[in-house]
């Protein structure tokens, strides 16, 4: 479970297909 | 300017402790992920271990994980690499290094100058 | 479990083009960056996105990605461009690749 201080903070992960590229890679979202 | 500066590297003994400091300036730490990479002598780059901007995002590479803790504080801009139970093939050259701007931070932007860790009884 | 391979290393002349690869299982699936290391210095960011260079990275640096294979383009090549280059890539939030390294020597 995050932390609540952690709760704004986007969370990053691997995945593909995710923030708006057709790719592989690391995403960034809140 | 932005830069990176490490410290805390030294000769450690196998089964020992080191904690690896990396003091950020010239750009806004809180808002960057930060990796710390290793090169031993002679050899490649290895990535360690990545923070990401919450103290709870953070991953490792199956080499270190359980032995090394990554973690940051952002009121002191500054990234930390507690490292236990070192082993030989733990001598390299650490860098700490920024992961680039934007929601899809892919490469090593800023890379500090490195500081040696070496393994040795 | 995945590994990047580069040729060890590769030579050429002042102001030709120098080519170095970067190959490893579905890379063109994922983004590749390249990386300058001069002897005795810290890696520089070359090119990311596969193909996007830094601000302040020369324009003869440019990059490509499809297939298996990422391939970094250095045209007419100077000596200041020695060095060892390695390519990087995610396979996981855990796996971080980089390649071997490929040292180009400007002949």
């Known amino acids: 479970r995050r932390r609540r201080r952690d709760t704004h903070f986007p969370i990053c992960i691997f995945c593909c297909g995710c923030c708006h590229r057709s790719k592989c890679g690391m995403c960034c979202k809140t | 300017q932005v830069q990176l500066v490490e410290s805390g590297g030294g000769v450690v003994q196998p089964g020992r402790s080191l904690r690896l400091s990396c003091a950020a300036s010239?750009?806004?730490?809180?808002?960057?992920?930060m990796h710390w990479v290793r090169q031993a002598p002679g050899k490649g780059l290895e990535w360690v271990a990545v923070?990401?901007?919450?103290?709870?995002?953070?991953y490792y590479a199956d080499s270190v994980k359980g032995r090394f803790t990554i973690s940051r504080d952002n009121s002191k801009n500054t990234l930390y690499l507690q490292m236990n139970s070192l082993r030989a093939e733990d001598t390299a050259v650490y860098y700490c290094a920024r992961a680039q701007e934007g929601i899809a931070p892919d490469a090593f932007d800023i890379w500090g100058q490195g500081t040696m860790v070496t393994v040795s009884s | 479990s995945y590994e990047l391979t580069q040729p060890p290393s590769v030579s050429v002349s002042p102001g030709q083009t120098a080519t170095i690869t970067c190959s490893g299982d579905?890379?063109?699936?994922?983004?590749a960056c390249w990386y300058q290391q001069r002897p005795g210095q810290s890696p520089v960011l070359v090119i990311y996105?596969?193909?996007k260079r830094p601000s302040g990275i020369p324009e003869r640096f440019s990059g490509s990605n499809s297939g298996n294979t990422a391939t970094l383009t250095i045209s007419g090549t100077q000596a200041m461009d020695e060095a060892d280059y390695f390519c990087q890539a995610w396979y996981s939030s855990t796996n971080v690749l980089f390649g071997g390294g490929t040292k180009l020597t400007v002949l």
């Open positions: 579905k890379l063109g699936e994922r983004y």
């Open positions: 923070i990401w901007y919450a103290e709870s995002n953070k």
């Open positions: 996105q596969d193909s």
């Open positions: 010239g750009f806004t730490f809180s808002s960057y992920g």
